[in-house]
């Protein structure tokens, strides 16, 4: 039969961040191809990445039509050149992905510091409300958008001469922290879910200190 | 089922140093925040510092800072306590506890704790 | 840092009384106020948390309560094993810190 040497997928994982998913796995093709389907638990498989050679299919626009949905899906082999030929029992081969449910699961992408104003011995700290691909009439929804108050942000900030780590949290995208007069701050953020088990935090954003760019210095 | 088992205390001398061990089950450290509270016999609760395992940031309370270091080994689920030089008002039990991360709760699951005593 | 003063340091109180503790901060600290019960040779155990929110598995006779920067922890109706030492713990700035601690005895 021409599906002697087609082998199924294996190690079928979901790469997600801030809800843009990608579905990988294994082998990399040798006279074979490959084409996805993915469904919800209740709904039907819906064909994605037709007869690619990759080892990979982007399955963001689907996810993202309810992110807080369970989802699977399926990778199946075809011999390269003769996509209509059926594994032994009539069927092609397939491997089923483990469920994936973008809200719980999605990583939080790296957050960003997009900008600090210092008043006197307050700083005002602001995080970029970054931009997903799930749509709402239209639009574009921010991590805010999505998450609501499920997601808050860590602060961490250290005077330019120590190296110990204060914290402030938010579930807004706004710090207001207290600093002491005529010193130097630097600053990170991290994104953090709390009510998840796992994928609870982002990695940090880059650091940002006082005396560059982003920030503005107010002596009032 | 969240446990946090403090281990390595004991009976040491002024100068000397210790490394107390906090091993975490039941969830992963590098996903919360692991605390140091300490309590002098006798007394009350005295937070000492805590570490981002995540990515390794610590602050420790001005009693302990340049004294004390707080680490993790993330493979191993476990956060350290290295305690030196030990002086005799360190003498007190050592509590490891996991901050939780949220605006509204913090420490929500404590070991049982490890007795050090700083005597000659 | 901010200093969270806790008052009374000990009291003395039945079975069946209404025992009240508080907390007052030195500054706002928002509703980032925990309280923790502790028994003798036994680690703190989280009662409340966010000022007023009942920690899970903590019975209903527990209760927390804000005004400004004043907490206060209630026992509505104290149990038998409800005889122990109470802090309270701010989590707004770093470092937190912990009230001194009421210790609750049999009258």
């Known amino acids: 039969s021409g599906t002697t040497n087609t082998v199924a997928a294996y190690n079928l994982t979901w790469k997600s961040t801030n809800f843009k998913t990608i579905l990988e796995w294994e082998p990399k093709p040798v006279n074979q191809v490959y084409t996805v389907q993915i469904s919800t638990k209740s709904g039907d498989w819906k064909s994605k990445c037709f007869y690619t050679t990759d080892t990979e299919c982007d399955l963001t626009d689907e996810i993202v039509k309810d992110v807080k949905q369970t989802y699977l899906a399926r990778v199946f082999s075809y011999p390269a050149g003769n996509v209509e030929s059926t594994g032994s029992a009539g069927e092609p081969l397939y491997e089923n992905s483990p469920e994936f449910t973008p809200y719980l699961e999605t990583n939080l992408g790296q957050p960003t510091i997009q900008s600090f104003e210092q008043v006197g011995t307050k700083v005002n700290v602001t995080v970029e409300d970054e931009r997903t691909l799930v749509r709402r009439n239209n639009t574009f929804l921010s991590l805010r958008d999505v998450f609501g108050k499920d997601l808050i942000y860590t602060l961490y900030y250290w005077k330019s001469s120590s190296s110990g780590k204060k914290t402030a949290k938010t579930n807004t995208n706004e710090f207001l922290i207290d600093v002491d007069k005529g010193e130097n701050y630097c600053f990170s953020v991290q994104a953090v879910i709390p009510s998840r088990t796992v994928n609870r935090k982002s990695t940090d954003s880059p650091v940002e200190c006082m005396g560059q760019e982003k920030g503005e210095f107010r002596e009032i | 089922e969240v446990q946090l088992v403090e281990s390595g205390g004991g009976l040491v001398q002024p100068g000397g140093s210790l490394r107390l061990s906090c091993a975490a089950s039941g969830f992963t450290i590098s996903d919360y925040w692991i605390h140091w509270v300490r309590q002098a016999p006798g007394k009350g609760l005295e937070w000492v510092g805590y570490i981002d395992p995540y990515n390794g940031y610590t602050y420790y309370a001005d009693s302990v800072k340049g004294r004390f270091t707080i680490s993790a080994d993330t493979s191993k689920n476990t956060a350290y306590l290295q305690m030196n030089p030990l002086r005799a008002e360190d003498t007190a039990v050592y509590y490891c506890?996991?901050?939780?991360?949220?605006?509204?709760?913090?420490?929500?699951?404590w070991g049982q704790g490890t007795l050090v005593t700083v005597s000659s | 840092d901010i200093q969270m003063t806790q008052s009374p340091s000990s009291l003395s109180a039945s079975v069946g009384d209404r025992v009240t503790i508080t907390c007052r901060a030195s500054q706002d600290v928002n509703t980032a106020v925990a309280w923790y019960q502790q028994k003798p040779g036994k680690a703190p155990k989280l009662l409340i948390y966010?000022?007023?929110f009942l920690y899970s598995g903590v019975p209903s006779r527990f209760s927390g309560s804000r005004s400004g920067t004043d907490f206060t922890l209630t026992i509505s109706s104290l149990q038998p094993e409800d005889f122990a030492t109470y802090y309270c713990q701010q989590h707004y700035t770093t470092p937190p810190t912990f009230g001194q601690g009421t210790k609750v005895e049999i009258k």
């Open positions: 966010s000022a007023s």
């Open positions: 506890a996991r901050d939780y991360g949220s605006l509204q709760v913090q420490l929500d699951y």
